[in-house]
């Protein structure tokens, strides 16, 4: 006699064979906060940007990617303390002389009003009220994200 | 009338409330290869180590973490060409003067026989036959991993 969960595994596997999607997150893991179609994890410890990226990766997640001003504001509303900074998945690409998201796309200049310099070894942090350029070696908190709802036929080509 | 998949969503959500696990991958996404309890994605493009880490992260996966010699050999068996190098999730920590996995753990010296220097800006690549220390700026392929089976009560504290 199969449990309902085991039966589900079969159902979802059969569904995947038709849709080539991964099951995805149906709701957020414990300790993660839902914000629309994402799950966010606000770290309690501090790290330089690179270690923050690594931490999110080992959690099978990404440093926060912000689509637009609206998402920025909604994320900032979850930050309780005005003075705390959190790394997101945006840093300065020296070769391309531009702000680059870790998914390879460039920052749309209208999306975020960045305070500070656009230069080598600069990474982006957000606070409750602002977006800052900081040295990537600065040890602050960070935000990881997971996509909550699976996208049909989502595949993973190289960046 | 709910579809079997929608019913499953409810069942799995109810199950999660009891076990605090995330649904996890039931099988590997398209283009990913199963190796035991992991899904692996071998890139077809090249990148420095840092960009490879970012790429895996945006795919909600991790640069490959290798538990032991046995897993290394099984992974190497999937590499077709003797000369091609792939980044894994291991680099040299200057502050700790040791090889460090991106999940924060240190390399067990018996696990991998590394050819090359343990020094600043060194990252680890694997080939079909060996494990090499290379400059992290070297542009080679990389391997991302996703855990295939969920672990009961798996939570995500900070590293």
């Amino acid at each position: 006699q199969k449990s309902s969960i085991e039966k589900c595994s079969v159902d979802i596997q059969q569904s995947r064979n038709k849709t080539t999607e991964r099951p995805g997150l149906l709701n957020c893991p414990i300790y993660w906060q839902q914000l629309r179609e994402k799950c966010l994890l606000f770290s309690h410890t501090v790290n330089p940007w690179n270690n923050s990226l690594a931490d999110c990766s080992t959690k099978e997640s990404s440093l926060l990617l912000i689509r637009d001003k609206d998402e920025l504001i909604h994320t900032q509303n979850l930050i309780r303390d005005k003075a705390i900074l959190f790394w997101i998945g945006l840093n300065f690409s020296l070769s391309e002389k531009n702000w680059k998201w870790i998914n390879g796309s460039f920052l749309n200049s209208n999306d975020l009003e960045i305070r500070g310099d656009a230069k080598e070894n600069s990474c982006i942090s957000i606070s409750q009220t602002s977006v800052y350029s900081e040295y990537c070696s600065t040890e602050i908190r960070w935000i990881c994200q997971k996509e909550l709802t699976p996208v049909r036929n989502k595949v993973y080509p190289d960046s | 009338q709910k579809s079997s998949i929608e019913k499953c969503s409810v069942d799995i959500q109810q199950s999660r409330n009891k076990t605090t696990e995330r649904p996890g991958l039931l099988n590997c996404p398209i283009y990913w290869q199963q190796l035991r309890e992991k899904c692996l994605l071998f890139s077809h493009t090249v990148n420095p180590w840092n960009n490879s880490l970012a790429d895996c992260s945006t795919k909600e996966s991790s640069l490959l973490l290798i538990r032991d010699k046995d897993e290394l050999i099984h992974t190497q068996n999937l590499i077709r060409d003797k000369a091609i190098l792939f980044w894994i999730g291991l680099n040299f920590s200057l502050s700790e003067k040791n090889w460090k996995w991106i999940n924060g753990s240190f390399l067990n010296s018996n696990d991998l026989e590394i050819r090359g220097d343990a020094k600043e800006n060194s990252c680890i690549s694997i080939s079909q036959t060996s494990v090499y220390s290379e400059y992290c700026s070297t542009e080679i392929r990389w391997i991302c991993q996703k855990e295939l089976t969920p672990v009961r009560n798996k939570v995500y504290p900070d590293s």
Epitope: - | V46, G116, Y135
Partner: antibody
Framework: QVQLVESGGGLVKPGGSLRLSCAAS????????MSWIRQAPGKGLEWVSY????????AYADSVKGRFTISRDNAKNSLYLQMNSLRAEDTAVYYC???????????????WGRGTLVTVSS | DIQLTQSPSSVSASVGDRVTITCRAS??????LAWYQQKPGKAPKLLIY???SLQSGVPSRFSGSGSGTDFTLTISSLQPEDFATYYC??????????FGGGTKVEIK
Amino acid sequence: QVQLVESGGGLVKPGGSLRLSCAASGFTFAQYYMSWIRQAPGKGLEWVSYISPSGSTIAYADSVKGRFTISRDNAKNSLYLQMNSLRAEDTAVYYCARSLMATGTHLYFDLWGRGTLVTVSS
Amino acid sequence: DIQLTQSPSSVSASVGDRVTITCRASQDISSWLAWYQQKPGKAPKLLIYAASSLQSGVPSRFSGSGSGTDFTLTISSLQPEDFATYYCQQVTSFPPYTFGGGTKVEIK
């Protein structure tokens, strides 16, 4: 057709400058380490310089360091070698060469151009 | 810098002969070695990489072996189109990427 075509060679006086170009076609240029290799008349092969796929890492042979500059334009599928302060001993056929993909800085040259002759003489 | 010494510097052979060329490195280069063939007025052609891997499109009569400091290129049965100069090259990840002095294979 997968190929590399060099241009820009010629006769130049000692102390002069020359810019070599290499046009790549038939492959994804931006994914490969590219090099310049030269061969003096009747002599063996000498590696001159390499550039990484993104252009972020560059290396030179000691014999040309400070005088030659390698660069690339991935949008134009082109590789360049700017040669300044040329000497008689720089006289050679200059080849543009592609390295096997994903072998990093272990440069196995799997595709070569036909070469362009640079003659440095007064 | 790593020096590569090829021997012999020239060899006279006939069609059908087995020809062996050696390359000795001044220090351990693991398997980071390539072999090239060059004909007069032409660019070199990659034959063998990673000491023993045959490059795509290269006839199977060519083979490479060795690791560390001693390497061999073997042509099992010499063909008319094989008369050329052969170079070894070390490709450890640190420049310069030195070539051997070359071995000329001539018709006996």
